[in-house]
């Protein structure tokens, strides 16, 4: 016979049930009733064989990240509460989680919190008006880099080809240019725009499309048409890595991306 409610515990892990969509952050709070002189706080996931797999730890005012940097532990100002977050949760992150405290000498012992369940659901397709959300996962940084570099090269080649075609079609054009269309009208994304991967390229956000937009019609016959590279509206701040956006949105920050949940 098991009790319907949980016993009082020196460790609590909440919420008991958490549901997030894939790509969203999942955050649990591990709370200690009080802080012993020295302790280690571990974050565990329960394996299918009911064993505890350590995800990350906190010891001696120091965070000890696990192998997967998506699992982050942050100590809150009151000292007794710890945020335990999964950044950009994946479908296979669904499962049972708990925190455990090891109290070091003189009274060495181990306490485990009650368990909590995380459910990561598939991302539902949202109307384009809604805010963008991160893609479920990348197949690998290397693949992203290759695709990105290739897309940039293809784009540059297409622009050169376009310039050459225009020069051949309008050989008499000498000077002047005309911007057709409103300046503040944003560049519209077609439904078949492919996702773009985060690249360590410095300050620029490169947009890549499978279909090259057709050249705008010239306003007057005797004018040269200049090819224009369109950059996204938000300028990249100096020293910050620019990440290419996509239909599903930008990648979540990685631990080295700045403060986030990771303590300095």
């Amino acid at each position: 016979l098991d009790s319907p409610d949980r016993p009082w515990s020196p460790l609590t892990f909440s919420p008991a049930q958490l549901t997030v969509q894939e790509g969203e952050n999942a955050t649990f709070t591990c709370s200690l009733a009080d802080i012993p002189d020295s302790f280690v706080l571990n974050w565990y996931r329960l394996s299918p064989r009911n064993q505890t797999d350590k995800l990350a730890a906190f010891q001696e005012d120091r965070i000890e990240p696990g192998r997967d940097r998506r699992f982050r532990v942050t100590r809150l100002p009151n000292g007794r509460d710890f945020h335990m977050s999964i950044v950009a949760a994946r479908l296979n992150d669904s499962g049972i989680y708990l925190c455990g405290a090891i109290y070091l000498p003189p009274n060495t012992q181990i306490n485990e919190s009650p368990r909590a369940e995380l459910s990561v659901t598939e991302r539902t397709l949202e109307p384009p008006t809604q805010s963008p959300s991160p893609p479920p996962r990348l197949s690998g940084q290397l693949q992203g880099l290759v695709i990105g570099v290739t897309s940039v090269l293809v784009g540059v080649l297409l622009l050169l080809l376009l310039t050459w075609v225009l020069a051949a079609v309008f050989p008499r054009a000498t000077r002047g240019a005309c911007v057709c269309g409103s300046e503040d009208e944003p560049l519209k994304e077609g439904p078949d725009a492919a996702p773009v991967f985060t690249l360590d390229y410095g300050e620029l956000d490169f947009q890549w499309r499978e279909k090259t937009p057709e050249p705008p019609a010239p306003c007057a016959p005797e004018q040269t048409e200049y090819a224009t590279i369109v950059f996204p509206g938000r300028p990249a701040s100096p020293g910050r890595r620019a990440s290419a956006s996509s239909l599903q949105g930008a990648q979540p920050p990685s631990p080295e991306d700045g403060p986030g949940l990771w303590p300095p």
């Epitope: 016979l1 098991d2 009790s3 319907p4 409610d5 949980r6 016993p7 009082w8 515990s9 020196p10 460790l11 009733a33 009080d34 802080i35 012993p36 002189d37 007794r80 109290y103 003189p106 009274n107 012992q109 306490n111 485990e112 009650p114 368990r115």
Partner: antibody
Framework: EVQLVETGGGLVQPGRSLKLSCVAS????????MTWTRQAPGKGLEWVAS????????YYPDSVKGRFTISRDNAQNTLYLQMNSLRSEDTATYYC?????????????WGPGTMVTVSS | DIVMTQTPSSQAVSAGEKVTMSCKSS????????????LAWYQQKPGQSPKLLIY???TRESGVPDRFIGSGSGTDFTLTISSVQAEDLAVYYC?????????FGSGTKLEIK
């Protein structure tokens, strides 16, 4: 050797206040959770108040909540119980107890107790 | 609140006999996640303060003779003294620490014939 010694008991009139003390020795006081438990004459044991190691969390039954306050001075290895608005049903021997298994409220060590009599 | 009921309220046995006493809780003290029962047993000899005998329903406190055996799970618990000695004359209390408020049973008084 673990020792807990309670002091401060005595005869007090209903409605008045009394403060009990418990001096601990033989263990690292500031690492352990402490509790006051009482026993009315010829009766059973009743839990009165509990406090965690740094004093950040305290717990009381409804019978004393708002009237009794548990506190501790870790520098002095001392546990306190401030009892206000005393009633005749508070008459009992008050035991200071330690929970050496960090975070679980069963009591490894008990002091000899101090008698509190509430009577007019 | 979790109510603890102890039976019998008193019993008299001869030295060397086996004795059992019962403690029932109004709700289960077993927590499935750690498979532990949040129950302790104390012994209080005449004129003395209580002493911890058993915790987690069956774990004997260090220094406690092995004739004291705690058993049971969920809501039904038993303290057994396999061979009663004269010095076992005392009142025995069970206590739940599953949840606040912490509660004790009313006690079982053991008398020696």
């Amino acid at each position: 050797e673990v020792q807990l010694v309670e002091t401060g008991g005595g005869l007090v009139q209903p409605g008045r206040s009394l403060k009990l003390s418990c001096v601990a020795s033989g263990f690292t006081f500031n690492n352990y959770w402490m509790t006051w438990t009482r026993q009315a004459p010829g009766k059973g044991l009743e839990w009165v108040a509990s406090i965690t190691n740094s004093g950040v969390s305290t717990y009381y039954p409804d019978s004393v909540k708002g009237r009794f306050t548990i506190s501790r001075d870790n520098a002095q290895n001392t546990l306190y119980l401030q009892m206000n608005s005393l009633r005749s049903e508070d008459t009992a021997t008050y035991y200071c107890t330690s929970a050496l298994n960090w975070g679980y409220w069963y009591f490894d060590f008990w002091g000899p107790g101090t008698m509190v009599t509430v009577s007019s | 609140d979790i109510v603890m009921t102890q039976t019998p309220s008193s019993q008299a046995v001869s030295a060397g006999e086996k004795v059992t006493m019962s403690c029932k809780s109004s709700q289960s003290l077993l927590y499935s996640e750690n498979k532990k029962n949040y129950l302790a047993w104390y012994q209080q000899k005449p004129g003395q303060s209580p002493k911890l005998l058993i915790y987690w329903a069956s774990t004997r406190e260090s220094g406690v003779p092995d004739r004291f055996i705690g058993s049971g799970s969920g809501t039904d618990f038993t303290l057994t003294i396999s061979s009663v000695q004269a010095e076992d004359l005392a009142v025995y209390y069970c206590q739940q620490y599953y949840n606040f408020p912490l509660t004790f049973g009313s006690g079982t008084k053991l008398e020696i014939k």
